[in-house]
Interface confidence: low
């Protein structure tokens, strides 16, 4: 019968001919009366056999990631009679893995959006690298993830590639972050290969800023001839938030005379001071009112940022008009 051991050839071998093993018949007494033949895909081009001894060699560099096994057939013939000594037999040459592929992040570029002020531990995104090496061959394809850039705001779980928030972030200070993740094979041992990817993390706005008046005092004038409903000037607050979170409402906080009103222009986010009752220079030539401003939408959990509304003082001078 046929005698052989399991055949393995390491990939990427640079030797011009690499001895893999020997195929032989147990009837072969070593007097060169038998001839061995190799058949099948790769026979003669990738693999050769010593016709006398049955020794098999690889004559080409192999890449396991391209092809991991070869199925060949062997024959042994008695040279004197030309007859087969053994029935033709099929055998396998396995290409064994070396760590020649670095981990690759196939889904990049990665982007994620996370609300600002999210608590520690909030999941941002999961990055996944793949390694073309053999996962069953030692640690060649066993990966560990680490953070090269992004501390102290982010952390990565070493075995899963899950990125989490590790420190609260304020969009108003910085609205995007570059996080660089490294994946290393061989679970970080010597000879490890690595790959990196960038993750763009964009902070979405939450309503963590209240509107604040630009000025603590506004001076406006109104003619005593102005009819009720007249716009006598505008006041303005600023809000570091954006979009809906920066929409605001102005209102009167203090006006003993009940002469004025404030309406909000939701396009410009300005407060328009309106005359509610006619004024008379001879009766009162100046007024002092206090206005306040609040955000339009404030979720319950963000009320802590909006405890005390910003206020401003408005001095209104009445202009005299000659009366008949």
């Amino acid at each position: 019968g046929w005698v052989w051991n399991q055949f393995f050839v390491p990939e990427e071998m640079n030797t011009t001919s690499h001895h893999i093993g020997q195929l032989r018949s147990d009837l072969d007494n070593g007097n060169n009366s038998f001839q061995y033949k190799l058949l099948g895909a790769g026979a003669g081009s990738t693999f050769i056999i010593d016709e006398r001894t049955g020794d098999i060699y690889a004559i080409q560099k192999l890449d396991r990631e391209e092809r991991s096994l070869y199925i060949l057939r062997a024959q042994v013939i008695d040279i004197a009679t030309g007859r087969a000594v053994e029935p033709e037999s099929e055998f396998v040459i396995k290409v064994s893995d070396i760590n020649d592929n670095e981990p690759k992040f196939l889904d990049e570029p990665y982007e994620a959006i996370v609300p600002e002020m999210s608590p520690e531990g909030t999941l941002v995104i999961q990055v996944t690298a793949s390694d073309a090496d053999d996962p069953s061959s030692g640690n060649n394809a066993r990966l560990l993830y680490s953070l090269l850039q992004g501390q102290p705001y982010f952390s990565v779980e070493p075995t899963t590639g899950v990125i989490r928030i590790s420190s609260k972030m304020d969009r108003e200070l910085q609205d995007e972050y570059w996080v660089i993740i490294q994946a290393k094979d061989m679970i970080g041992q010597p000879g490890a290969l690595s790959g990196t990817t960038s993750v763009l993390i964009k902070l979405s706005d939450v309503n963590d800023n209240k509107p604040i008046f630009k000025e603590s005092l506004y001076r406006l004038t109104v003619s005593e001839s102005a009819p009720t409903g007249t716009s006598i000037g505008t006041i303005m607050a600023y809000d570091n938030d954006i979009g809906e979170n920066a929409e605001m409402d102005y209102s009167i906080e203090e006006d003993d005379s009940q002469t004025f009103d404030i309406i909000t222009n939701h396009e410009t986010q300005e407060g328009i001071v309106i005359l509610k009752k006619k004024v008379d220079f001879e009766h009162q030539n100046h007024y002092g009112i206090r206005a306040k401003v609040k955000n339009h939408h404030v979720p319950e959990q963000l009320m802590k940022y909006h405890t005390e509304a910003s206020t401003t003082f408005i001095k209104i001078q009445v202009e005299d008009v000659d009366e008949p």
Partner: antibody
């Protein structure tokens, strides 16, 4: 490698409409936005609008609102851009460009361009 | 009149470093990622830099992008004759709810 192949050059009279196609291949068509950008002779690039092929959601530049229609056919992985009421200043090369999975992500692949000439 | 402002032209000699600027506002560059496109004569634009400073595969590391506040810039070091092209910045504008391009910069490589 992603491929975007556009339909051939067109010559149109003022007042007519033109429909340009862009056939996508070698990627998941329904996952990415597709924009249309035009370039008049000797001029810069001008964004016209964007479509998400899976739901057909569109956003058009203010300038083209009411004149442009973008559609997608998922069965053939093709997007179309139709521009109506053509005038001579619409003479330009029209490009389709693949966007990202988000509206605000870059255009990474471009079609070869389709020259539309508007002349009486 | 483009929403993003670029110089109409720039030039340099081979080996030099050239920078092209792109100026915008809070609603575009200030809020989103800047991308740069290269358009060689008679060809479709090609993505050169994305998300402010990332290079697609195949783009030499001579090209780099940066962003600060409401401005961005493209730097080309070790200028080569094949870099002669039009360069455009582009960004999504939150106010306009659409994409905006710079007017383009024609780069000339002087021999």
């Amino acid at each position: 490698q992603v491929q975007l192949v556009q339909s051939g050059a067109e010559v149109k009279k003022p007042g007519a409409s033109v429909k340009v196609s862009c056939k996508a291949s070698r990627y998941t068509f329904t996952s990415y936005y597709m924009s249309w950008v035009r370039q008049a002779p000797g001029q810069g690039l001008e964004w016209m609008g964007i479509i998400h092929p899976s739901g057909g959601d569109t956003t058009y530049a203010q300038k083209f609102q009411g004149r442009v229609t973008m559609t997608g056919d998922t069965s053939t992985s093709t997007v179309y851009m139709e521009l109506s009421s053509l005038r001579s200043e619409d003479t330009a090369v029209y490009y389709c460009a693949r966007g990202g999975i988000k509206l605000w992500l870059h255009f990474d692949y471009w079609g070869q361009g389709t020259l539309v000439t508007v002349s009486s | 009149q483009s929403v993003l402002t670029q110089p109409p032209s720039a030039s340099g000699t081979p080996g030099q470093r050239v920078t092209i600027s792109c100026s915008g506002s809070r609603s575009n560059i200030g809020s989103n990622f800047v991308n740069w496109y290269q358009q060689l004569p008679g060809t479709a634009p090609k993505l050169l830099i994305y998300t402010n400073n990332q290079r697609p595969s195949g783009v030499p590391d001579r090209f780099s992008g940066s962003k600060s506040g409401t401005s961005a810039s493209l730097a080309i070091s070790g200028l080569q004759s094949e870099d002669e092209a039009d360069y455009y910045c582009a960004v999504y504008d939150e106010s306009l709810q659409g994409w905006v391009f710079g007017g383009g910069t024609k780069l000339t490589v002087l021999s």
